[in-house]
Amino acid sequence: ECVTQLLKDTCFEGGDITTVFTPSAKYCQVVCTYHPRCLLFTFTAESPSEDPTRWFTCVLKDSVTETLPRVNRTAAISGYSFKQCSHQISACNKDIYVDLDMKGINYNSSVAKSAQECQERCTDDVHCHFFTYATRQFPSLEHRNICLLKHTQTGTPTRITKLDKVVSGFSLKSCALSNLACIRDIFPNTVFADSNIDSVMAPDAFVCGRICTHHPGCLFFTFFSQEWPKESQRNLCLLKTSESGLPSTRIKKSKALSGFSLQSCRHSIPVFCHSSFYHDTDFLGEELDIVAAKSHEACQKLCTNAVRCQFFTYTPAQASCNEGKGKCYLKLSSNGSPTKILHGRGGISGYTLRLCKMDNECTTKIKPRIVGGTASVRGEWPWQVTLHTTSPTQRHLCGGSIIGNQWILTAAHCFYGVESPKILRVYSGILNQSEIKEDTSFFGVQEIIIHDQYKMAESGYDIALLKLETTVNYTDSQRPICLPSKGDRNVIYTDCWVTGWGYRKLRDKIQNTLQKAKIPLVTNEECQKRYRGHKITHKMICAGYREGGKDACKGDSGGPLSCKHNEVWHLVGITSWGEGCAQRERPGVYTNVVEYVDWILEKTQAV
């Protein structure tokens, strides 16, 4: 059962796993949610009745019954982890804590103009977990405007104390705001020879990489595969760090793989969600329960529904035994990973999908693309919306993309002459325009946010956000698309599609069925040659065939240029402008979304 409210002046008795320090009860709840075993917590707020050494303590707790006895205690705030909830969870914490000094290892000290600049510095520093900034009112002259970057083993402060005229806060890496490079390369036959900060067991290098990504101190990793010669090290995932933030060297070793934490692009990759099944593989751990199940998929569902289950092993039924049901072993461990992985015993293993909600919804796999043809099928582009105007009569105005449960990203030029958001309707999960009737449900628009530097499509900044009046419930036919990572600027997208209900030729009409076209990206240099009279800036991206024939056209504006990378769809462009439609040597010009990620996050995450 999901309990979100905090219990004031209440302490949970017993069940302690560990104690950390957090600046607020709200953040204690987040820490509990991300901890592999924590189900409940008790936080101690600052209070004259409490010993100051206990202020800001966050005690993480576990219980077989998922609850603990409650005791009244002044200044104690207790609650439950969000593991029990189905809603989206984020580790992003933009709060600034006034007059609090969050203690850690001070590894970097520099002058900063403001707390915001200090936070940005922390976000763009590979080691930084949190910071403390001495304001210009700080008593000690030599410490004023000093920005201290800090890290700890856990990513949370080792202590928090009251200190006048300082502010503290956390790195915004988990808010997708870091400019650090995202090194997605996996290096086969490679060992990184640097300090191990931790080691866990993992079934493959991808799970090892994901564990590294959400481990606060891990910057890169080395994984020993099941063919590794030393039996005791098989399936071992070594989590590593170094002073420089990069491996000091690479050593060639067969059957080892190495790679990097994807911390700076984790919002557009699954990190917590290990959805694969591992055949002929047994995961060892503390046994939670043994239940009968028809299949390994059913076993995974059972694990996902049991809040304390972290992973499972399914042993298929022997012929005609137990009504064809196999045994489903639900398991857990102290760190969420198997304590040992064995091969060749016939089991099928995997992980709970409960943690998938800690990943961005946009990373969820959607149904496979339909190859060939130009008409889409239902659920093929679940982020695509049709934006209608009701004035003077109702009609399709532009396309758009769902990027959050209350946000649509589209083009600014769509709103020429639109006086009020009241005349707009957003329809999601639509394949055919003919489905839209008088009684078809839609989302009203609360606010239109146009980039303040927008003048006309051809001069750039052709981007706008629509804030919806109500939230979108994600389903197979309506879900968000990931924004590209700023750390991914060097990625070459080779699988890009433009979609919309727009014209199929210059003089035409709006199409009934959502159309799709696979279109290659064109370099900005090449694009500039095709548009001598315009300035193709780095904030634009072009796509099209040299010979023409496939392109976006009137009515597609604002819609997505969607590119698939590492099995995840990214909103690379917003259909903006072009010379005619599908003309030879006239590529379509799109708003380059990666250049506006900061702007999008600033507007959508505004408190």
Epitope: A181, R250, K252
Partner: antibody
């Protein structure tokens, strides 16, 4: 067919700068780690620098660390080497090469000569 | 850092001969060694990797052996186009290091 074409070499004074380019074709450039290897006149081969496919991690020989910068533009299929504070001992033919999973330099360009002299 | 030493620095042989070039690493490098051929005025060409694996397209008269610190490149039945300079390269760890080269000349 894999092709690597270096350019940008020439005569430069000690302390000067030069930028080498390597245009790649015939393979998926963004999937490959790339490197620069040099050869001083009449001498052996010396590895200079490497860069991973994403461009996010670079490695350098001690002899060039802090002076040379390797980079790549995957959209242009081009590898670069920015050489600053050049010294007479940097005089060499500079080759661009692909670095394979075998930990060998699979394909090489024809090289470009850099001469550092006053 | 690992250093590589090749011997001899030059060798003379005739067409049809069998030639052996050796390479020694300053520390054990398992079988992580590559061999290259460089003809005058040309770029090097990868012949062998992992001490004994032949790169595709390389004639079978080239063979490699060894592990740990001592390695050999053998060329059977020398052909005119085989007269060139040969380099070994340790592929164990960064920084990558080459041997100083062995020049194979026509006797």
């Amino acid at each position: 067919e894999v092709q690597l074409l270096e350019s940008g070499g020439g005569l430069v004074q000690p302390g000067g700068s030069l930028r080498l380019s390597c245009a790649a074709s015939g393979f998926t450039f963004s999937d490959y780690e790339m490197a620069w290897v040099r050869q001083a006149p009449g001498k052996g081969l010396e590895w200079v620098s490497s860069i991973v496919p994403s461009g996010g991690w670079t490695l350098y020989a001690d002899s060039v660390k802090g002076r040379f910068t390797i980079s790549r533009d995957n959209s242009k299929n081009t590898l670069y080497l920015q050489m600053n504070s050049l010294r007479a001992e940097d005089t060499a033919v500079y080759y661009c090469a692909t670095w394979g999973d075998s930990w060998g330099f699979d394909f090489w360009g024809q090289g470009t000569l850099v001469t550092v002299s006053s | 850092d690992i250093q590589m030493t090749q011997s001899p620095s030059s060798v003379s042989a005739s067409v049809g001969d069998r030639v052996t070039i050796t390479c020694r690493a300053s520390q054990g490098i398992s079988s992580w060694l590559a061999w290259y051929q460089q003809r005058p005025g040309k770029a090097p060409k990868l012949l062998i990797y992992d001490a004994s694996s032949l790169q595709s397209g390389v004639p079978s008269r080239f063979s490699g052996s060894g592990s740990g610190t001592d390695f050999t490149l053998t060329i059977n039945s020398l052909q005119p186009e085989n007269f060139a300079t040969y380099y070994c390269q340790q592929a164990d760890s960064f920084p990558i290091a080459f041997g100083q080269g062995t020049r194979l000349e026509i006797k």
